[in-house]
């Protein structure tokens, strides 16, 4: 009972993990525009992964997409990667773990099959929320180390000097999703590969009869199992798993707007 | 779009006055409203603003303390009291409805205020 | 507070005749985030409020005569009528709109001969 449930949990903490990895993912707020150093401008600016907004004082925002990929920088790029694999990662595993757990049937699926599959899912999140963890960690390092530079815009660039008011940016509310989600997804995977353990077919133990024979003793352990002098058992103990259930991961939202009044 | 603001005013020194301004043609809560001073023959000065949706409000420093804005959703007006006025508070109050690029689209007529003994 | 000045104060044209007026800023009004300045043009004819010209110092507000064009970047602005008529009688008012408290210019004064 306790293997399932291990499952179950392991696969819905993924579930909503993998949720929050591709929210943060797709969210704007990235970088936030350093409200502390600067907080007497009329316009919020702040960026995503994808795209970089401007909330101004009147309500109007405006986001604009980076159109370029050559002209990005090599770490958002790398950023990028390590979320859409860990996306990618987590679906499949997410996936695999929906046929691996106990409480599906699936034609005459083995129970062995079902050890592998949960132990491969749970390597799936696992590696998946790594990979979310890095990806935010280094855009993180990567605002660390712009943050005392006055940067005219931190991907687009801006060809010749153009004078701006120094923006700097701090972390926006995607990281902390991020490494939330990068968390969830690692915690869920790990419980996958404990489940894992618990799932393999039990080995059939007998107790052991003893026969005395003329003049000698020894014990027979019958099933095919090599004798072994003495009465004692070094077999192990497996938990049998007897299904468990699965809910369902609800949508989150996340509030991201700044207003000024 | 419409502003319409109240009618002049003359109020003695030390009192105070509430000045309205009244919108319509647009959904009130979406748009802020910004008031402006203009002393007769002078510049304009911004005094602050108000978010009508969900009554927050930002001043000029200079301000503070003497305008109080406050709006009502429900009759799609935005108020500003002016207190403990002196002569230099006299002066035509304009209210404006905040637009693209932090602009002030759309103006009311404006309201006099003479301060005077 | 961030200071608007405006040039010249005043200036008298002949209808059709070509009108520039400057504004410059004490700080860039240049937002990093989107590449705009924040300087916006008013028009206020003798009794009436301001009207709106420009905003993000070139984008014309709709309704406005094409005559009127807005220019510049950072902390240098500038307002062209290209041929000016005898209604744009005003006086023209330049504000920031990117740093808190929003100022105005002093304004110019345009008069028709």
């Known amino acids: 009972m306790a293997v399932t449930a291990c499952q179950g949990l392991g696969f819905v903490v993924s579930l909503i993990g993998i949720a929050g990895i591709i929210a943060a993912t797709c969210m704007d707020q990235w970088s936030t525009q350093d409200l502390y150093n600067n907080p007497v401008t009329a316009v919020f600016n702040y960026q995503g992964l994808w795209r970089s907004c401007v909330r101004e004082s009147s309500g109007f925002t405006e986001c604009r997409g980076y159109f370029t990929l050559l002209g990005l920088p090599a770490m958002l790029q790398a950023v990028r990667a390590l979320m859409i694999v860990g996306i990618v990662l987590g679906a499949i595993g997410l996936l695999v773990s929906i046929f691996a757990l106990k409480c599906i049937r699936i034609g005459s699926m083995e129970d062995s099959a079902k050890a592998n599959m949960t132990l491969t899912s749970g390597i799936m999140f696992i590696v998946s929320g790594l990979c979310a963890i890095a990806g935010v960690s280094v855009f993180a390092n990567m605002l660390v180390t712009n943050f005392w530079m006055s940067t005219a815009n931190m991907y687009t660039g801006m060809g010749g000097m153009v004078q701006t008011v120094q923006t700097r940016y701090t972390f926006g509310a995607a990281l902390f999703v991020g490494w939330v989600a990068g968390g969830l997804t690692l915690i869920g995977g790990v419980m996958m590969c404990i489940a894992c353990r618990g799932l393999a077919p039990e080995e059939t133990n007998y107790k052991a009869v003893s026969y005395h024979a003329s003049g000698h003793s020894v014990a027979y352990k019958p099933g095919g199992f090599k004798a072994s002098t003495g009465f004692g058992s070094n077999t192990k103990n497996k938990k049998i798993y007897d299904g468990g259930a699965r809910t369902e991961d609800e949508v989150q939202s996340y509030p991201s707007k700044h207003d000024y009044v | 779009v419409q502003l319409q603001e109240s009618g002049a005013e003359l109020v003695r020194p030390g009192t105070s006055v509430k000045v309205s301004c009244k919108a319509s043609?647009?959904?009130?809560?979406?748009?802020?409203i910004e008031w402006i001073k203009q002393r007769p023959g002078q510049g304009l000065e911004w005094i602050g603003m108000?978010?009508?949706?969900?009554?927050?409000?930002k001043y000029n420093e200079k301000f503070k303390g003497k305008a109080s804005l406050t709006a009502d959703k429900t009759s799609s007006t935005a108020y500003m009291q002016l207190s403990s006025l002196t002569s230099d508070d006299s002066a035509v109050y304009f209210c404006a409805r905040g637009g693209f690029g932090n602009s002030f689209a759309y103006w009311g007529q404006g309201t006099l205020v003479t301060v005077s003994a | 507070d961030i200071m608007m000045t405006q040039s010249p104060l005043s200036l008298t044209v002949t209808a059709g005749e070509k009108v520039t007026m400057t504004c410059k800023s004490s700080q860039s009004l240049l937002n990093s985030g989107n590449l705009k300045n924040y300087l916006t043009w008013y028009q206020q004819k003798p009794g009436q409020p301001p009207k709106l010209l420009t905003y993000w110092a070139s984008t014309r507000e709709s309704g406005v005569p094409t005559r009127f064009t807005g220019s510049g970047s950072a902390t240098d602005f500038t307002l062209t009528i290209s041929s000016v008529q005898a209604e744009d009688l005003a006086v023209y008012y330049c504000q920031n709109a990117y740093f808190y408290p929003y100022t105005f210019g002093g304004g110019t004064k345009l008069e028709i001969k």
């Open positions: 043609g647009y959904a009130f809560t979406n748009y802020l």
């Open positions: 108000i978010n009508p949706g969900s009554g927050g409000t």
